[in-house]
């Protein structure tokens, strides 16, 4: 949960407020209490954002872009609060706001610099393209341009392709990494410096497992303590790669503690789940169960991917029948 906005104090009568796209913020302004208060909020010294005098709002000349988006803290004006409550900020709202407050004994102006950030939760995807394997870190909407870093086995790597598309008010970014033939662990970090928000994606390849038909397999999936916080909402998904696409076997939502299972042979141990262990069992294996199994643990702050390769071989009986 993030605050409505956060303030950075700078010298004299100027403050910086950082807000998030589509969220509400407060532009702060205070004065010594006084009578006959006049308040004018303006954008870039030109556009009228909000006017208050003679005890009420006067919005006849308000710029249309602020219609139904602004209000004051009316019960607190008499106590010296001229702050503006600003609804659903957009990137077009970025800029300098000036608050003029006049009373019978005092005149002050406060400048507020509004910066707006966007950080829609990124994702880490594992893809197969022909014979190549790729990890892709992507974020659908981010502003300003984020810092993306990759690590292999905890060592930073310089190879960092970034596919960027800019829309009217934010960037969409993909950063693919070719991991063909590698069994190293990989980590991708996306940082929004304005919102001071960091997301991490981690990918781990487990040793291949060889099983006989009709046996069962246990696949481990335990989050790394560095990232995992059990009191934060997260989702766990187990999928199986079939002909280049993943099909979901089961998923678990921490918020509702619901488990949804799409494959009757799949089982989860409730007690282990309560201990944040999302290892699964797949019973009665058949040849078509061979492939890659992906455990995805995701929250707003991280994605942890664990991949298992399972080889199912015919049992002796099956082989002799053939």
């Amino acid at each position: 949960i993030f605050p409505l906005a956060f303030f950075i104090y700078v010298p004299m009568n100027e403050q910086i407020v950082i807000g998030r796209l589509d969220e509400d913020i407060i532009l702060p302004s205070s004065f010594e209490r006084g009578s006959e208060v006049v308040i004018h909020w303006k954008y870039q010294d030109s556009y009228k954002v909000h006017s208050y005098y003679k005890g009420s709002d006067h919005l006849e000349s308000q710029d249309p872009r602020y219609a139904n988006r602004t209000s004051l803290f009316y019960n607190e004006i008499q106590n010296g609060n001229a702050s503006l409550f600003f609804r659903r900020v957009s990137l077009l709202d970025e800029g300098i706001y000036t608050c003029y407050v006049g009373t019978a004994i005092q005149v002050i102006t406060n400048k507020v610099v509004l910066k707006v950030g966007v950080f829609l939760t990124p994702v880490m995807k594992y893809e197969k393209r022909n014979t190549n394997s790729f990890l892709i870190c992507s974020v659908l909407s981010v502003y300003p341009r984020p810092i993306i870093t990759w690590k292999m086995d905890n060592t930073p790597i310089s190879e960092n392709n970034m596919e960027e598309t800019g829309s009217l008010d934010s960037f969409s970014i993909n950063s693919p990494l070719n991991i063909t033939g590698s069994n190293s662990s990989y980590e991708c970090t996306i940082e929004n410096s304005l919102l001071k928000q960091t997301w991490t994606g981690r990918w781990t390849m487990k040793d291949g497992l060889h099983k006989m038909q009709s046996e069962h397999v246990s696949l481990s999936c335990q989050p790394v303590n560095d990232y995992f916080s059990p009191n934060q909402d997260f989702k766990v998904t187990w999928s199986r790669m079939k002909s280049g696409t993943f099909s979901v076997l089961a998923y678990y939502l921490s918020s509702s503690q619901n488990t949804i299972i799409n494959e009757s042979r799949f089982s989860w141990n409730k007690e282990l789940i309560n201990q944040s262990d999302f290892s699964m069992n797949l019973m009665d294996l058949n040849l078509s169960d061979s492939g890659e199994y992906l455990c995805n643990i995701s929250s707003d702050e991280y994605t942890l991917l664990t991949i298992h390769t399972v080889h199912v071989e015919p049992s002796q009986e099956t082989a002799s029948h053939n």
């Epitope: 004299m12 009568n13 010594e32 006084g34 006959e36 006049v38 004018h40 005098y53 003679k54 006067h58 006849e60 000349s61 003029y100 006049g102 009373t103 019978a104 004994i105 005092q106 005149v107 002050i108 102006t109 406060n110």
Partner: antibody
Framework: QEQLQQPGTELVKPGASVKISCKAS????????MHWVKLTPGQGLEWMGT????????SYNQKFKGKATLTADKSSSTAYMQLSSLTSEDSAVYYC?????????WGQGTTLTVSS | DIVMTQSHKFLSTSVGDRVSITCKAS??????VAWYQQKPGQSPKLLIY???TRHTGVSDRFTGSGSGTDFTLTISSVQAEDLALYYC?????????FGGGTKLEIK
């Protein structure tokens, strides 16, 4: 009785700076904004800017930004206006005036003459 | 900026007359207008604020009226001591603007 005392005259050379004082008495200096107003025969009265001594918050008329700098000294209940890079255009009567958005008490004015 | 215009630079009147000094704002200022009187050799004195509120100690011969963009200062019965320059000022928003002034002359 509220009073604002200003020096009567200042004679300064072009290019120099001058700091005009305004000493307040008879009221709580830090509670009221102090404004500065320029009077010339051609332009009449022009509001230059204001300072609120309580927190030294300043507001300027864009026309005088960079020309005038307002300060206040609470310990001596005195407001100051410094004018820089003076030219003959700056020759005028300068008033300090107490108040919020209207000015209820005025100083007697300082006649500034910029001449070599 | 909200500019104030006083159309009459001079007004000539006689003692005992009723005189009206007008002032126009370049945009709506509600009733946020003040009037000042400046006698020769003196600093300005506040007469009226919020268009019609008399400042402490101001004679009730002075009355202010108007709202929006048009404002009037009326002196009901002019006295010799009213010989002065009269300025209007918008106190709606900064930068505050004064009108150019109207000089009241006694015939």
């Amino acid at each position: 009785q509220e009073q604002l005392q200003q020096p009567g005259t200042e004679l300064v050379k072009p290019g120099a700076s001058v700091k005009i004082s305004c000493k307040a008495s008879g009221y709580t200096f830090s509670s009221y904004s102090m404004h500065w107003v320029k009077l010339t025969p051609g332009q009449g009265l022009e509001w230059m800017g204001t300072i609120y001594p309580g927190n030294e918050n300043t507001s300027y008329n864009q026309k005088f930004k960079g020309k005038a700098t307002l300060t206040a000294d609470k310990s001596s209940s005195t407001a100051y206006m410094q004018l820089s890079s003076l030219t003959s255009e700056d020759s005028a009567v300068y008033y300090c005036a107490r108040g919020g958005y209207y000015f209820d008490y005025w100083g007697q004015g300082t006649t500034l003459t910029v001449s070599s | 900026d909200i500019v104030m215009t006083q159309s009459h630079k001079f007004l000539s009147t006689s003692v005992g007359d009723r005189v009206s000094i007008t002032c126009k704002a370049s945009q709506d200022v509600s009733t946020a207008v003040a009037w000042y009187q400046q006698k020769p050799g003196q600093s300005p004195k506040l007469l009226i604020y919020w268009a019609s509120t008399r400042h402490t100690g101001v004679s009730d011969r002075f009355t202010g009226s108007g709202s929006g963009t048009d404002f009037t200062l009326t002196i009901s019965s002019v006295q010799a001591e009213d010989l002065a320059l009269y300025y209007c000022q918008q106190h709606f928003d900064i930068p505050y603007w004064f009108g150019g002034g109207t000089k009241l002359e006694i015939k």
